[in-house]
């Protein structure tokens, strides 16, 4: 706010006031004496840069009066009172009343004094984020969406990751006059490294305190990545009975595990049981390829593992044996 | 109804002071300031001053300043201007009046410096 | 001083007609602005304040508009009553100061 003037009557009032769409706004204005000054208001106005005549009046005999007087109103100014408070009301805010208004006393003897007041009429949009569901492109596609609807002005969308990504952001009218719906994408090559992290959508707007944090898990569909895990290249005959997995990552998950080998069926020494095969005692070197093949909605995936079962000493940590 | 009443005719001589009254009725005196204007038929309306009888603060046109001198009296609810030192220029119906801030004027005395 | 000059002086009119009556000020104003009608031998009379509003008991055919420095008052259906001198007054800066009136006649 200015501040007081020193020796003459001075106007207070915000160089600025928000309001909110279709809500009601106070234009808050006041008339500052100092201690030693006297000054008599006669009048109260109100008008709007740029249009002809005023938009409400407070006089002293006469009392208020308005351009549309179902939308204005002088929140203190009282008939057969002091008129030292010209704040003016205003009802359902629309777009186009947003500008630079005056509001001017006219007083004695010091004469008329004025202030400008910028009136921003804004609109709070309501923002959502949602997970674009990919699959394995080799090319960059949206990965995320975010969405602010209905803003006054349009809402300010950034990303916050560590996976990299570029933002491709648009904007339209919103459904009320005056207000932009902001989209914004968070575009990146999809992997499977990707899936399962998140995302953070930013957005900022004068209407709020804080900005909004949304947060996005993202999703990328792709077909198993198969890997087989268990065998240490230290199995050796007459050791313990052993446990080989199928470690399979995918989107969706895994349908199906099928054990074989090059040779085609899994000997009798190999017993599938879903992820994971066991491997029993066996009493002569073996050396197959064993390969796991996994399933899911998208196709299937195999991994390989060469197994040697050799002859030497069993150690008491490794190796297959019969109890 | 508000009535501002003033002396209808003043003849006075050159070189002399002349005090027109202008008694308020029908709305509280106080509240609002009251203001003299003088109309000829060379000049038109002409502002002179205004004082606010509730405080007693006046204000001047630069021309009129030496003049005129402005009071009021509370009590009997009267505001007064004091011509001095008149010449015939000063020849001119003299008004009190709320002006914009009510409808009514006085009836206007007019002065004669002869 | 501001100054308001006001036009025409003089202006001839028939019963019904519409008329208007221009002020401009020397610098902005903004709506304070009054006008006055002065019957002959009467005071004048308050028609209009803040440059649009009128006082209550003037008909609405007399109409204030302007801001700034442009000033108009209209009439309209003229009456035979409205035969008058009418006058503006800006009221934003002391000394006030009053347009030199235009004299509104019959044909």
């Known amino acids: 706010w200015p501040p007081p003037g020193t020796g003459d009557v001075v106007v207070q009032a915000p160089t600025q006031v928000p309001g909110f769409l279709g809500d009601s706004v106070t234009l808050p204005c006041y008339l500052q004496v100092p201690n030693m000054e006297v000054t008599h208001v006669s009048q109260l106005t109100w008008a709007r840069h740029g249009e002809s005549g005023s938009m409400a009046v407070f006089h002293q005999t006469q009392g208020p009066s308005y351009s549309e007087s179902k939308r204005l109103e002088f929140v203190a100014a009282r008939l057969g009172a002091e008129l030292r408070n010209a704040s003016l009301r205003m009802f359902g805010l629309r777009v186009e009343d947003e500008g630079n208004y005056t509001c001017l006393f006219v007083t004695f003897p010091q004469g008329s004094r004025s202030v400008d007041i910028w009136l921003r009429v804004l609109a709070k949009p309501q923002n959502t984020a949602e997970v674009q569901k990919v699959q394995l492109t080799g090319e960059p596609v949206p990965m995320a969406r975010c969405v602010s609807t209905g803003g006054r002005p349009p809402a300010q969308i950034t990303w916050h990751s560590d996976l990299g990504g570029m933002p491709n952001t648009s904007q339209v009218p919103g459904f009320l006059s005056g207000t932009v719906t902001v989209t914004s994408l968070w575009i990146l090559v999809p992997s499977s490294q990707v899936d399962g992290k998140n995302v953070t959508c930013k957005v900022e707007h004068e209407s709020f305190e804080k900005p909004q944090l949304l947060t996005v898990n993202l999703t990328v569909y792709y077909p198993p990545e198969v890997s087989i895990s268990g065998y240490d290249n230290n199995w050796y005959l007459g050791q313990n009975e052993a446990t080989l997995t199928c470690d399979a990552r995918s989107n969706p998950e895994p349908t199906g595990y099928n054990w074989s080998t090059t040779m085609g069926p899994l000997p009798p020494f190999a017993v599938a049981q879903g992820a994971q095969l066991l491997i029993r005692p066996v009493d002569k070197p073996i050396n197959t390829t064993l390969i796991c093949n996994v399933t899911n909605a998208l196709g299937a995936r195999q991994a390989e593992l060469t197994v040697q079962v050799k002859e030497g000493p069993p150690s008491e940590h490794s190796g297959i044996s019969r109890n | 109804q508000v009535q501002l009443q003033q002396p209808g005719a003043v003849l006075v001589r050159p070189g002399a002071s002349v005090k027109l009254s202008c008694k308020a009725l029908?709305?509280?005196?106080?509240?609002?300031?009251m203001h003299w204007v003088r109309q000829t038929p060379v000049h038109g309306l002409e502002w002179i001053g205004a004082?606010?009888?509730?405080?007693?603060?006046?204000a001047y046109n630069q021309k009129f300043k030496g003049k005129a001198t402005l009071t009021a009296d509370k009590s009997s609810s009267t505001a007064y201007m004091e011509l001095s030192i008149l010449t015939s220029e000063d020849s001119a119906v003299y008004y009190c009046?709320?002006?914009?801030?009510?409808?009514?004027w006085g009836q206007g005395t007019t002065l004669t410096v002869s | 001083d501001v100054v308001m000059t006001q036009t025409p002086k003089f202006m001839s009119t028939s019963v019904g007609d519409r008329v208007s009556v221009t002020c401009k000020a020397s610098?902005?104003?903004?709506?304070?602005v009054a006008w006055y009608q002065q019957k002959p031998g009467q005071s004048p009379k308050a028609l209009i304040y803040s440059a649009s509003y009128r006082y209550s008991g003037v008909p609405d055919r007399f109409t204030g508009s302007g801001s700034g420095t442009d000033f108009t008052l209209t009439i309209s259906n003229v009456q035979s009553e409205d035969l008058a001198d009418y006058f503006c007054q800006q009221y934003n800066t002391y000394p006030l100061t009053f347009g030199a009136g235009t004299k509104l006649e019959l044909k």
């Open positions: 004082i606010h009888p509730g405080s007693g603060v006046t």
């Open positions: 610098q902005n104003v903004g709506t304070n």
């Open positions: 029908g709305y509280t005196f106080t509240d609002h300031e």
């Open positions: 009046t709320p002006l914009w801030l009510r409808r009514d």
